[in-house]
């Protein structure tokens, strides 16, 4: 018999490399039986996880699993870091593994000289 506990399926040490300036959806896969739990996202700041209050979120329902989505529209350099989702149901609370976003700042990357340019400047 399948467990009817709520489960959050974020893989341990999962990560995403993404570009600033483009949209991104961070998904928290949620498995539940009867009532959908209350799910939130937070961002790790040292040992504490700061709840993301003013951010856009939505649910995507699929046949066997649901996804609680944190929307980045767009991704900002400041979004770099680790995130965790947590679910409250009845009197229980569970937390997912953290997932890390590695944000590339495309503007500063395009403005920066390449390694070859840097080397030629250094030796010129």
């Amino acid at each position: 018999k399948e467990s009817c506990d709520v489960q959050l399926y974020i893989k341990r040490q999962s990560e995403h490399s993404i570009l600033a300036g483009d949209p991104f959806e961070l998904e928290c896969p949620v498995k539940y039986c009867a009532n959908r739990p209350h799910v939130t996202w937070c961002k790790l700041n040292g040992t504490t996880c700061v709840k993301l209050e003013d951010r856009q979120t939505s649910w995507k329902e699929e046949k066997n699993i649901s996804f609680f989505i944190l929307h980045f529209e767009p991704v900002l350099p400041n979004d770099n870091g680790s995130y965790r989702c947590s679910a409250n149901f009845q009197s229980n609370r569970i937390e997912s593994h953290s997932t890390t976003l590695y944000v590339t700042d495309v503007k500063s990357a395009s403005e920066r000289p390449s390694k070859d340019e840097m080397a030629s400047r250094f030796w010129a």
């Epitope: 570009l19 483009d22 209050e53 856009q56 767009p74 400041n78 495309v106 395009s110």
Partner: antibody, heavy 120, light 106 residues
Framework: QVQLKESGPGLVAPSQSLSITCTVS????????VHWVRQSPGKGLEWLGV???????SYNPAPMSRLSISKDNSKSQVFLKMNSLQTDDTAMYYC??????????????WGQGTSVTVSS | QIVLSQSPAILSASPGEKVTMTCRAS?????MHWYQQKPGSSPKPWIY???NLASGVPARFSGSGSGTSYSLTISRMEAEDAATYYC?????????FGGGTKLEIK
């Protein structure tokens, strides 16, 4: 310097479609997003949607079913298409560049706008 | 959608007078942008992310606020400040604008 210029038909008959082209210079469409905003006397400023640098789009859910935004990176052009126009779609249509800083996103450079009147 | 309500709709101020206009959001937003528009022209960025003045904006302008309440203040009104000011949120799609505050010179 950064510039955006809209070109549209001016007059559109009710139930017809609207096509506007935004031609940009001074920046790349692969680095910056371009938004469409309209301004009408009745509704004020209304954000319609955006073409993101990577080619994805986001739309205002209200007029979304009638809207389509596309682009041609090589020509530095972004296109707005809107179907089934009604008289309340009469407005000034602006294309606007979007830019991010470390911790916020905003629309910085605006085109001069193109006036669209829906009338028979 | 997040509704932005600006007040007052019309504001009349004398040169040198301190001016404050407000923008209230129906739900909490991370920050607020402000745009200035003069008749016949496109909106211009005026204040970014609640309190950062856009390039070329005089230091007599300032912005403040958090959550659902934001404001734009002019320490000393000048004739060139007469315009319509719009607040704008980029926290939740659809990204909405306020109805504007029209600032007139007395």
């Amino acid at each position: 310097q950064v510039q955006l210029k809209e070109s549209g038909p001016g007059l559109v008959a009710p139930s017809q479609s609207l096509s506007i082209t935004c031609t940009v210079s001074g920046f790349s469409l692969t680095t910056y997003g371009v938004h469409w905003v309209r301004q009408s006397p009745g509704k004020g400023l209304e954000w319609l949607g955006v073409m993101w640098p990577g080619g994805r789009t986001s739309y205002n859910p209200a007029p979304m079913s009638r809207l389509s935004i596309s682009k041609d990176n090589s020509k530095s052009q972004v296109f707005l298409k809107m179907n089934s126009l009604q008289t309340d779609d009469t407005a000034m249509y602006y294309c606007v560049r979007g830019d991010y800083e470390y911790d916020y996103y905003a629309m910085d450079y605006w085109g001069q706008g193109t006036s669209v009147t829906v009338s028979s | 959608q997040i509704v932005l309500s600006q007040s007052p709709a019309i504001l009349s101020a004398s040169p040198g007078e301190k001016v404050t206009m407000t923008c209230r959001a129906s739900s909490s937003v991370s920050y607020m942008h402000w745009y200035q528009q003069k008749p016949g022209s496109s909106p211009k960025p005026w204040i970014y992310a609640t309190s950062n003045l856009a390039s070329g904006v005089p230091a007599r302008f300032s912005g403040s606020g958090s959550g659902t309440s934001y404001s734009l203040t002019i320490s000393r009104m000048e004739a060139e400040d007469a315009a319509t000011y719009y607040c704008h949120q980029w926290s939740s799609n659809p990204y909405t604008f306020g109805g504007g505050t029209k600032l007139e010179i007395k």
